[in-house]
Amino acid sequence: GITNINCSGHIWVEPATIFKMGMNISIYCQAAIKNCQPRKLHFYKNGIKERFQITRINKTTARLWYKNFLEPHASMYCTAECPKHFQETLICGKDISSGYPPDIPDEVTCVIYEYSGNMTCTWNAGKLTYIDTKYVVHVKSLETEEEQQYLTSSYINISTDSLQGGKKYLVWVQAANALGMEESKQLQIHLDDIVIPSAAVISRAETINATVPKTIIYWDSQTTIEKVSCEMRYKATTNQTWNVKEFDTNFTYVQQSEFYLEPNIKYVFQVRCQETGKRYWQPWSSLFFHKTPETVPQVTSKAFQHDTWNSGLTVASISTGHLTSDNRGDIG
């Protein structure tokens, strides 16, 4: 950066090189160039010469004043016009930053995704600070009082093997940068209560012949958790509003859920599960599309999730890939 240049003098910032966005700041430049009584001192911001708000303080020093400085980062340097020198002489340079102190971290959430081997903790960091902000996640055992600290820039994955102080913990997050420090409330957790079952996946759908045509959605999860509650939501792709069906599920076999749907309409399905009675849900599964046939089907066939299908046949949709859910992060 600009701070690595060889200086023939000194540049400094008041109140500091990192300051609160919107402040008035002063940048001072003091020349110390051999055989040079500067005729003029110049300031440059990001390589562009500044023309206003420059005050000469004495023979070697000048001040540049900014009102309501709003740029997150800027490279400043200053030069001197020396007699008998054709070019300006570089005095010194400095990188300056403006931003905000951190907000109090809130919505601290810790979950263990089944089979991951990690406890994942996230939080709402609040408004953008614009400057380097570090987070320390504190995990304190309610049984042994031992505390672990983890330094991070965003969320944290903590190996469950390192949580050796029993099952009950307090978790809190400390946010700090050059402008301040804040700390979240303490979240009390029990490791058995924060497990999110292995992802539920819709594998295929078919609409079969019956007095009233019936669509069966096939879905499964690799979870070993015995008591699991799930929700499946579905809607016509042209609709805004979801319909939701609830299930108490035993994943020892593939689940089959029946729906009576309108013919010749493209539907979208998603599923999510939680350990029964616990706090956190899986994110909604990938979007699964299925189009119902126009007429009562006669024959069984398969069609993929694209819109190609044969009118008048049993229509099957098979999951072929991951489509992004519209709100994957919904674990609350």
Epitope: V136, H138, K140, L142, T144, E145, E146, E147, Q148, Q149, Y150, L151, L170, W172, Q174, M181, E182, E183, Q186
Partner: antibody
């Protein structure tokens, strides 16, 4: 068994600084631990000054009144913790203790013998 | 800022009789509370941690109880060697930027 041995008594002038050391033996420096400092003015109660947490990273915490005046550091190579108090005034005359449990808990099984710092003009 | 308040501040006791000291936290500190005894001219010594766990080498006439905000230290039968100043200390968290002190004011126990 953890042992904490502190530096000797000091007499200081108002406005100056003092740096008290605390050499620890018996702490597993590969584990996480807190080392804290507590002071006690003559005839007064215990007053927490601050702590240093040493683990995968180092973190320091200070009492509200101590911020800007107290600096706590640790030199793992010599197993020594330091507490520096600047801008001394007569009210800082006290016995200064380092304290730890040798782990990352905040109660103190082990205390240094105390260092008397006298601030007098 | 968590404030620790002890009562009484002075406790005259009779050897062989029970004694009790109370400590109140201004907010929930779970069971993160320690008790210390400081005898004249000595460094403090840990008696109780985690509100109710007896520290190594401490006689079992000492016991601690409580959680949340209200805590008690009991001596079942006071002995002459128990005189000194007793302090409670919150051991929940020191990372909060507003902490002033983590100790109570102290309770002076002396023989009647």
């Amino acid at each position: 068994q953890v042992q904490l041995v502190q530096s000797g008594a000091e007499v200081k002038k108002p406005g100056s600084s003092v740096k008290v050391s605390c050499k620890a033996s018996g702490i597993d420096f590969n584990s996480n631990y807190y080392m804290c400092w507590v002071r006690q003015a003559p005839g007064q109660g215990l007053e927490w000054m601050g702590c240093i947490y040493v683990g995968s990273h180092v973190n320091t915490y200070y009492a509200n009144w101590a911020k800007g005046r107290v600096t706590i550091t640790a030199d793992e190579s010599t197993s020594t913790a330091y507490m520096e108090l600047s801008s001394l005034r007569s009210e800082d005359t006290a016995v200064y203790y380092c304290a730890t449990s040798g782990s990352s808990v905040l109660y103190f099984k082990f205390w240094g013998q105390g260092t008397l710092v006298t601030v007098s003009s | 800022d968590i404030v620790m308040t002890q009562s009484p501040l002075s406790l005259p006791v009779t050897p062989g009789e029970p004694a009790s000291i109370s400590c109140q936290a201004s907010e929930n500190i779970y069971s993160f509370l320690a008790w210390y005894l400081q005898k004249p001219g000595q460094s403090p010594q840990l008696l109780i941690y985690s509100a109710s766990k007896l520290a190594a080498g401490v006689p079992d006439r000492f016991s601690g109880s409580g959680s949340g905000t209200d805590f008690t230290l009991k001596i079942s039968r006071v002995e002459a060697e128990d005189v000194g100043v007793y302090y409670c200390q919150q051991t929940n968290r020191y990372s909060n930027p507003d902490i002033y002190n983590v100790f109570g004011q102290g309770t002076k126990v002396e023989i009647k």
